[in-house]
């Protein structure tokens, strides 16, 4: 179950540690936010810090060099190593859920494809800890709403298994 005990905000792997390209983004979010959108990258998963750093770089490279975005689209990425990787962070508008939802939400993406399996318990704990930390830091409203990517756009993301999982988290709300 999702926890909201902010006693310890687990450290987030900063951009310089996973050797991110410099961000070119400028659009700020208006905190605290009411919405969190959970997606999956639909690509390779990773289960060690080294492989997850590489995967974060891969996603960022695709978003910036192929799609021409100002940065990796997600505010945060979650690895199956149990770590949270900083994307655009709490302060900058993401490119994860379309232009209506992006300015009012934080986008967190699990690195991997979760159509047929759930993320590791470590990854799930990392995501839940991130959300609790967001509330504790004032980046998310205490009564924030959690959405699946497919709730806000026509997509299979975050995958059937991860989608079913987050629907049981207390902040999940439909429509």
């Amino acid at each position: 179950q999702e926890t909201e005990d902010p006693a310890c905000c687990s450290p987030i792997v900063p951009r310089n540690e996973w050797k991110a390209l410099a961000s070119e983004c400028a659009q700020h979010l208006s905190l605290p936010l009411r919405y969190v959108v959970v997606s999956h990258t639909a690509g390779s998963s990773c289960n060690t810090p080294a492989s997850c750093q590489q995967q974060a770089r891969n996603v960022q490279h695709y978003h910036m060099k192929t799609l021409g975005w100002c940065d990796v689209g997600y505010n945060f990425l979650i690895g199956e190593d149990g770590l949270v990787y900083e994307g655009r962070g709490w302060n900058f508008t993401g490119a994860h859920s379309g232009h209506l939802w992006n300015p009012m939400s934080i986008g967190i993406s699990f690195m991997g494809n979760y159509m047929d399996r759930v993320p590791t318990p470590q990854a799930i704990r990392a995501a839940q800890g991130l959300l609790a930390c967001g509330v504790a830091q004032g980046a998310l409203r205490s009564n924030y709403v959690l959405k699946g990517h497919r709730d806000v756009q026509r997509t299979l993301s975050p995958g059937n298994q991860l989608y079913h999982l987050i629907q049981n988290w207390p902040h999940y709300r439909s429509p």
């Epitope: 208006s30 009411r34 919405y35 379309g98 232009h99 209506l100 009012m104 409203r141 009564n143 709403v145 959405k147 709730d151 806000v152 756009q153 026509r154 709300r173 439909s174 429509p175």
Partner: antibody, heavy 120, light 106 residues
Framework: EIQLQQSGPELVKPGASVKVSCMAS????????MYWVKQSRGKSLEWIGY????????SYNQKFKGKATLTVDKSSNTAFMHLNSLTSEDSAVYYC?????????????WGQGTTLTVSS | QIVLIQSPAIVSASPGEKVTMTCSVS?????MYWYQQKSGTSPKRWIY???KLPSGVPARFSGSGSGTSYSLTISSMEAEDAATYYC?????????FGSGTNLEIK
């Protein structure tokens, strides 16, 4: 029962301005976006914009920028829409609408509407 | 901006008859929303996320569609269903409404 009570009908002269109010009751006002929609006589609906009462953030339809200004008074659970430089084209029924909490783009409760008539 | 074309503009149906109205969109949208408005009253939420019914909306109503074509269907017309129905998209700014389908009872 959730209610959005709008101010009464207005008859104003061209060039004047008007402020329409929308008082919310029986829900937590700051938890829900408030939207405004225009319905001209015998016509369809046009989205004007919305305001997040929590922090006052607004978003406008480009067509209504400079025409409409959205504000809130949290102490009285009231949203306001100020319309300026009125012309006959602004004559319409204006609705305030609450956006659902889980999906802010789903308009779940509508006010009764405020009829604005602009005439000399 | 995205344009929504509703057809027919006016439709007459007898009690018990099946009614279908459509909403054609100028470019693809993710979801469609429908509102019911009776004369002299405010619109009411009717169908959301293309096919979901809020509480209070009779099960004889259904919504379907994807991309640029959406529809609202009443399986068996009743007198209380006489109203104007508007479709609306939120995929692109600004959100836009269709011009409405006026459903009359025969």
């Amino acid at each position: 029962e959730i209610q959005l009570q709008q101010s009464g009908p207005e008859l104003v002269k061209p060039g004047a301005s008007v402020k329409v109010s929308c008082m919310a009751s029986v829900y937590s006002f700051t938890d829900y976006n408030m939207y405004w929609v225009k319905q001209s006589r015998g016509k369809s609906l046009e989205w004007i914009g919305y305001i997040d009462p929590y922090n006052g953030d607004t978003s406008y339809n480009q067509k209504f920028k400079g025409k409409a200004t959205l504000t809130v008074d949290k102490s009285s659970n009231t949203a306001f829409m100020h319309l300026n430089s009125l012309t006959s084209e602004d004559s319409a029924v204006y609705y305030c609408i609450r956006g659902d909490y889980g999906n802010p783009f789903y308009l779940d409760y509508w006010g009764q509407g405020t009829t604005l008539t602009v005439s000399s | 901006q995205i344009v929504l074309i509703q057809s027919p503009a006016i439709v007459s149906a007898s009690p018990g008859e099946k009614v279908t109205m459509t909403c054609s969109v100028s470019s693809s949208v993710n979801y469609m929303y429908w509102y019911q408005q009776k004369s002299g009253t405010s619109p009411k939420r009717w169908i959301y996320d293309t096919s979901k019914l809020p509480s209070g909306v009779p099960a004889r109503f259904s919504g379907s569609g994807s991309g640029t074509s959406y529809s609202l269907t009443i399986s068996s017309m009743e007198a209380e269903d006489a109203a104007t129905y508007y479709c609306q998209q939120w995929t692109s700014n600004p959100p836009t409404f269709g011009s409405g389908t006026n459903l009359e009872i025969k």
